[in-house]
């Protein structure tokens, strides 16, 4: 049923997050007269598109229209008809499409072209589909969580909106884990950002922020698993890969062609004398952790300190919100509580990975086996990435907050993206009269808009 126009003066915005494993549509709403205030925009709907990420449609672009239909129709229902024409729609594609573009710019353009044509058919104000950079993804995630946590607000509150909120204006760092990439973004403490590629300067609500960000392409949880399999099959020399990252008794046949399909496994590619191999789980956290560590090259670092693969990382500073797959995986494993120490998390992972596959299937009967089978790897990967990749310690682990939603809005890059593109984050403190567009952060300070 079509909603009646609401009496209050509200605005809506739609952002589609075209990730590597799936697409999600988010609908945001805010009071029109308060759009320059911090923390007024909130999410009213999330619609998960059925099917894989858009990069998987490269050989069947004609199916993209049908793929997007359900969620776009849902948006039509949620947003009053009178608002349709003025509701902006943005689609941002992330690492799955970055990888496709690395393989073929032409194929990536073809997919985006069909996506644009499909989205143009709806009565909304379609603003375009594009592949956002890893830097943007990190920056917008950081903006989202700090906007929702009220960190940009000048009014100091005597109460906290969320349980883990520190009652000060220090921003939270952002840790984002996707299927194909992972981002780390934070304000370092008086530290020179030694690598210009990792430096962002923002002026938001009258305050300057020097932000460090990096996106590790191929180090999202799904691509990291492909990398690990490709690395391990090199030395397995057998059609059977006994894998410590899967539960004992788990078996799965993998096509070598699928393994080498992604650019992320190119460095491990070799001619194998078989077309398929079988993963046999042996469920050993410690061995899984060791195997994952081999994906991180820590021997090369041209800076004062690095994360891995020669990428500069300043000393960690302050609290961090860990969202997207960091949250989904840890939530499934029941490890998101603030009270769970890193040692406890490791202990729980050891127990979980060692559980027989048949037992796991019975315990989590409602969960799709494809996802269920990968939680041991994903949980171990998260620990390896945070501890050895980003150099969190048992102590600084206490500063990681696994966040799904803040104030009912999903933590992720989409809200920050929309706030920027709709000029809703002013560079200066909002005055009583609206500011001209030239003073907005989008125009002056988003150095990360340059295409690479």
């Amino acid at each position: 049923t079509q909603n009646k126009a609401l009496p209050e003066n509200v605005k809506y915005g739609i952002v589609l997050d075209a990730g590597s494993s799936h697409t999600s549509l988010y609908i945001y709403k805010w009071p029109a007269e308060k759009e320059n205030d911090t923390g007024v925009v909130h999410q009213v709907e999330e619609c998960r598109v059925k099917g894989p990420g858009i990069s998987k449609f490269v050989q069947k672009v004609n199916e993209i229209g049908i793929y997007l239909t359900d969620c776009m129709e849902r948006a039509r229902e949620v947003i009053p008809r009178s608002q349709h024409q003025e509701t902006p729609v943005y689609l941002g594609a992330t690492a799955g499409m970055r990888l496709l573009r690395m393989e073929s710019e032409e194929l990536a353009d073809r997919v985006l072209d069909v996506v644009e044509r499909s989205l143009s058919n709806y009565p909304f104000d379609f603003q375009g589909a594009r592949i956002i950079t890893g830097q943007e993804e990190g920056a917008y995630g950081w903006i989202t969580i700090n906007y929702l946590l009220g960190k940009f607000s000048q009014k100091t509150r005597w109460f906290s909106i969320v349980p883990y909120e520190t009652n000060n204006q220090e921003t939270f760092g952002a840790l984002d884990l996707g299927g194909a990439s992972t981002q780390v973004t934070f304000v370092p403490q008086n530290q020179t950002i030694e690598s210009p590629d990792n430096a962002l300067q923002f002026r938001l609500y009258g305050k300057d922020y020097n932000v460090y960000t990096h996106s590790f392409l191929c180090y999202g949880k799904d691509q990291a698993l492909w990398q690990k399999l490709a690395k391990d099959i090199q030395v397995a020399s057998n059609e059977i890969l006994r894998d410590p990252c899967f539960h004992p008794g788990y078996k799965k046949v993998v096509n070598v062609s699928d393994l080498y399909k992604t650019p992320c496994t190119k460095r491990f590619e070799m001619t194998l004398p078989f077309q398929q191999f079988e993963i046999q789980g042996i469920g050993n956290y410690q061995q899984c952790h060791q195997s994952i560590l081999e994906l991180f090259n820590t021997s090369y670092c041209p800076y004062s300190q690095c994360a891995f693969n020669g990428i500069f990382l300043p000393p960690l500073q302050g609290d961090f919100g860990a969202f997207s797959a960091f949250y989904f995986v840890m939530k499934f494993l029941n490890l998101t509580s603030e009270k769970v120490s890193q040692e406890k998390v490791t202990e729980m992972m050891k127990k979980f990975c060692a559980q027989p596959w048949e037992e796991i299937k019975t315990s989590y009967a409602g969960v799709k086996e494809k996802y269920l089978s990968e939680y041991c790897f994903s949980g171990t990967y998260i620990l390896s990435l945070l501890l050895q990749g980003y150099h969190f310690t048992a102590d600084s682990w206490e500063h990681i907050h696994f966040i799904g939603k803040i104030q009912g809005s999903d933590a992720g890059w989409t809200l920050g993206y929309m706030l920027n593109l709709t000029n809703m984050i002013p560079a200066e403190q909002p005055l009583s009269t609206p500011l001209s567009h030239s003073t907005y952060v989008a125009h002056h300070h988003h150095h990360h808009h340059h295409h690479h």
Partner: antibody, heavy 119, light 107 residues
Framework: EVQLVESGGGLVKPGGSLKLSCAAS????????MHWVRQAPEKGLEWVAY????????YYADTVKGRFTISRDNAKNTLFLQMTSLRSEDTAIYYC????????????WGQGTTLTVSS | DIQMTQSPSSLSASLGERVSLTCRAS??????LNWLQQKPDGTIKRLIY???TLDSGVPKRFSGSRSGSDYSLTISSLESEDFADYYC?????????FGGGTKVEIK
């Protein structure tokens, strides 16, 4: 209990042929890759050949390539090494060992069978 | 081919003594390394796999470690049954290659 028992060694003249066997028991033979490794008198260990569980992969040391053939019969839980054009430097104790990544790489070895190549 | 250089080639030690053997890989083997023990009767037994993981049933006095391309086997306190030949084996690539061996003898 895992057991690997080699047999078929003996005295052969240079240029001659011989087939070694390795009988496996106590584990699922068809899941494991298998190796032959040898040790010449008073020398160290030298890897000779490998065959994967389903026989689709075979690797050989350069010193035996073209002369030795590794094979297996999963139904009979037996590994073989067919040796032709034998030379005096092939004289050694021949061991078979099983192999399964991640944690069973050459983890169990047979007691060895002796080949002597001499005129 | 990856060369494995093992040292020393032999050593004499007393019961209760701590001994270390080393293997250096000519190329990166990423921890894909076993330590094997060969008794005087020819019996071969794997002691350690993946550079540092002790095989089940192997006494805790044996330990393996890695420092860059150097891999070590340490016996913390020699016992009479430890007098044997020891070999390292890399399984990072084919051909599989062994170190030259270390003979541990009673002083």
């Amino acid at each position: 209990e895992v057991q690997l028992v080699e047999s078929g060694g003996g005295l052969v003249k240079p240029g001659g042929s011989l087939k070694l066997s390795c009988a496996a028991s106590g584990f699922t033979f068809s899941d494991y890759g298998m190796h032959w490794v040898r040790q010449a008198p008073e020398k160290g260990l030298e890897w000779v050949a490998y065959i994967s569980s389903g026989s689709s992969i075979r690797y050989y040391a350069d010193t035996v390539k073209g002369r030795f053939t590794i094979s297996r019969d999963n139904a009979k839980n037996t590994l073989f090494l067919q040796m032709t054009s034998l030379r005096s430097e092939d004289t050694a104790i021949y061991y078979c060992a099983r192999d399964l990544y991640y944690d069973h790489v050459l983890d169990y070895w047979g007691q060895g069978t002796t080949l002597t190549v001499s005129s | 081919d990856i060369q494995m250089t093992q040292s020393p080639s032999s050593l004499s030690a007393s019961l209760g003594e701590r001994v270390s053997l080393t293997c250096r890989a000519s190329q990166e083997v990423s921890g894909y390394l076993n330590w094997l023990q060969q008794k005087p009767d020819g019996t071969i037994k794997r002691l350690i796999y993946a550079a540092s993981t002790l095989d089940s049933g192997v006494p805790k006095r044996f330990s393996g470690s890695r420092s860059g391309s150097d891999y070590s086997l340490t016996i913390s306190s020699l016992e009479s049954e430890d007098f044997a030949d020891y070999y390292c084996l890399q399984y990072a690539s084919y051909p599989r290659t062994f170190g030259g061996g270390t003979k541990v003898e009673i002083k």
